[in-house]
């Protein structure tokens, strides 16, 4: 029986010689479970596994804990790859996280974290980040130290409010914190003064809702 090649992430895909951006099947670490992911093979040398994308408001991001755990949407468009896969992957080796942002005026910016991982579900997929560089603010718009993940049905934030219900979307909310890339999608000319929009405070401030976002990860040693 011919042995099937499995890919753990998009860096594996790239190293195998498949260097065209697109959707590839990835396998969970130490498992046969599979997931489909969009691989960006062009940005900064390629090998990036896309874990989130917002671009047109076509997908509802006000989802349950289980949906954020397993992922939703279409990897070629708006989607969330899934906390469980990302957690398992980023605990195998060191990963970097790149967040690419676009505003409605045609400007682009990014934040790059030199070390990123998510705790297991037992610890509510808490985010861990180190070493920020980039053009989307000198201060991290993801609260440091990292917070637990919250969704509309799992209130793990540090507010006497319920951040996920109020701001919409699942995120690593503080009280409620300087970012939420899974907030409500607002079209152009309706995207200001919106506290529940797609926010990256240290680039665009409190009420500005972004046009497009991508979150992607890659092994630090790629």
């Amino acid at each position: 029986k011919e042995e099937q090649i499995t890919f753990r992430d998009c860096a594996d895909v790239f190293r195998s010689g498949l260097t065209t951006s697109g959707i590839y099947t990835l396998t969970f670490p130490n498992s046969t479970e599979e997931t489909k992911a969009y691989c960006d093979m062009e940005t900064g040398g390629g090998g990036w596994t896309t874990i989130q994308r917002r671009e047109d408001g076509s997908v509802d991001f006000q989802r349950t804990w289980k949906e954020y755990k397993v992922g939703f949407g279409n990897p070629s468009g708006e989607h969330w790859l899934g906390n469980e896969f990302v957690s398992q992957l980023t605990n195998q080796q060191r990963y970097v996280l790149k967040i690419h942002l676009r505003d409605w005026e045609g400007n682009e910016a990014y934040s790059l974290y030199e070390h990123f991982y998510l705790s297991s579900e037992e610890f509510n997929y808490r985010i861990h980040l180190k070493g920020l560089t980039g053009t989307a603010g000198k201060i991290s718009s993801i609260s440091q130290p990292g917070n637990d993940f919250s969704t509309k049905d799992a209130d793990n934030d540090k507010c006497i409010c319920k951040c996920s219900q109020m701001l919409t979307g699942g995120w690593w909310f503080d009280a409620c914190g300087p970012s939420n890339l899974n907030g409500m999608y607002y079209p152009q000319r309706q995207n200001t003064n919106k506290f529940n929009g797609i926010k990256w405070y240290y680039w665009k401030g409190s009420g500005y809702s972004l046009k497009a976002t991508t979150m992607m990860i890659r092994p630090a040693d790629f």
Epitope: C159, I160, C176, Q190, N196, S206
Partner: antibody
């Protein structure tokens, strides 16, 4: 535990000045907008002033504009209200209050100080 | 400025019975983001006000579920399903949609 501890109240003559302080602890003070709200004896609540997390945005009620100055020192986790040209109608309990949400999202007051009484009388 | 009108101004209630307070605004409080910036506060005797309900209908953490807020636009209601002795005090609605923020006159809830 979030705490807002106020000081600086007292009895003052009309036309004189007073400075109120509000010392914050238990949260990242520099991330929150802060307010002063007052309550005249036996009356309801009246919003007085607001300052954004960085201090770059400031608003006042018409009744105190030009006489009161709100400020903050994020290094000291402290909020202030400088009250000049005080009038009898400024007599009230003054409360400092913290925005419910951080990063200058104005959705109500999640925490309040204990209040400090300012009495303006000759 | 937006005028907030509460009724009744005095509310005597028997413990275990429901209570309802109305709050009307002189202009709509519905923001373009779909939220009503309307909060409810309780000021117990000798204490500072405390947040009960934010954005019209969201209960703050630690607030008993017998408290509920509803309404949109100009008409809002705070309901207490079963009043308890510890609920006595003055209840205020406050709007934050239009600057400056303004409070209602307050409703004094007392036990019969």
């Amino acid at each position: 535990e979030v705490q807002l501890v106020q000081s600086g109240g007292g009895v003052v003559q009309p036309g004189r000045s007073l400075r109120l302080s509000c010392a914050a602890s238990g949260f990242t003070f520099s991330s929150y907008g802060m307010h002063w709200v007052r309550q005249a004896p036996g009356k309801g609540l009246e919003w007085v002033s607001y300052i954004s997390s960085s201090g770059s945005t400031i608003y006042y009620a018409d009744s105190v504009k030009g006489r009161f100055t709100i400020s903050r020192d994020n290094a000291k986790n402290s909020l202030y209200l400088q009250m000049n040209s005080l009038r009898a109608e400024d007599t009230a309990v003054y409360y400092c209050a913290r925005d419910l949400l951080d990063y200058d999202i104005l959705t109500g007051y999640g925490y309040w100080g204990q209040g400090t009484l300012v009495t303006v009388s000759s | 400025d937006i005028v907030m009108t509460q009724s009744p101004l005095s509310l005597p209630v028997t413990p275990g019975e429901p209570a309802s307070i109305s709050c009307r605004s002189s202009q709509s409080l519905l923001h373009s983001n779909g939220y009503n910036y309307l909060d409810w506060y309780l000021q117990k005797p000798g204490q500072s006000p405390q947040l009960l309900i934010y954005l019209g209908s969201n209960r703050a953490s630690g607030v008993p579920d017998r408290f509920s807020g509803s309404g949109s636009g100009t008409d809002f209601t705070l309901k207490i399903s079963r009043v308890e002795a510890e609920d006595v005090g003055v209840y205020y609605c406050m709007q934050g949609t239009h600057w400056p923020p303004t409070f209602g006159q307050g409703t004094k809830l007392e036990i019969k």
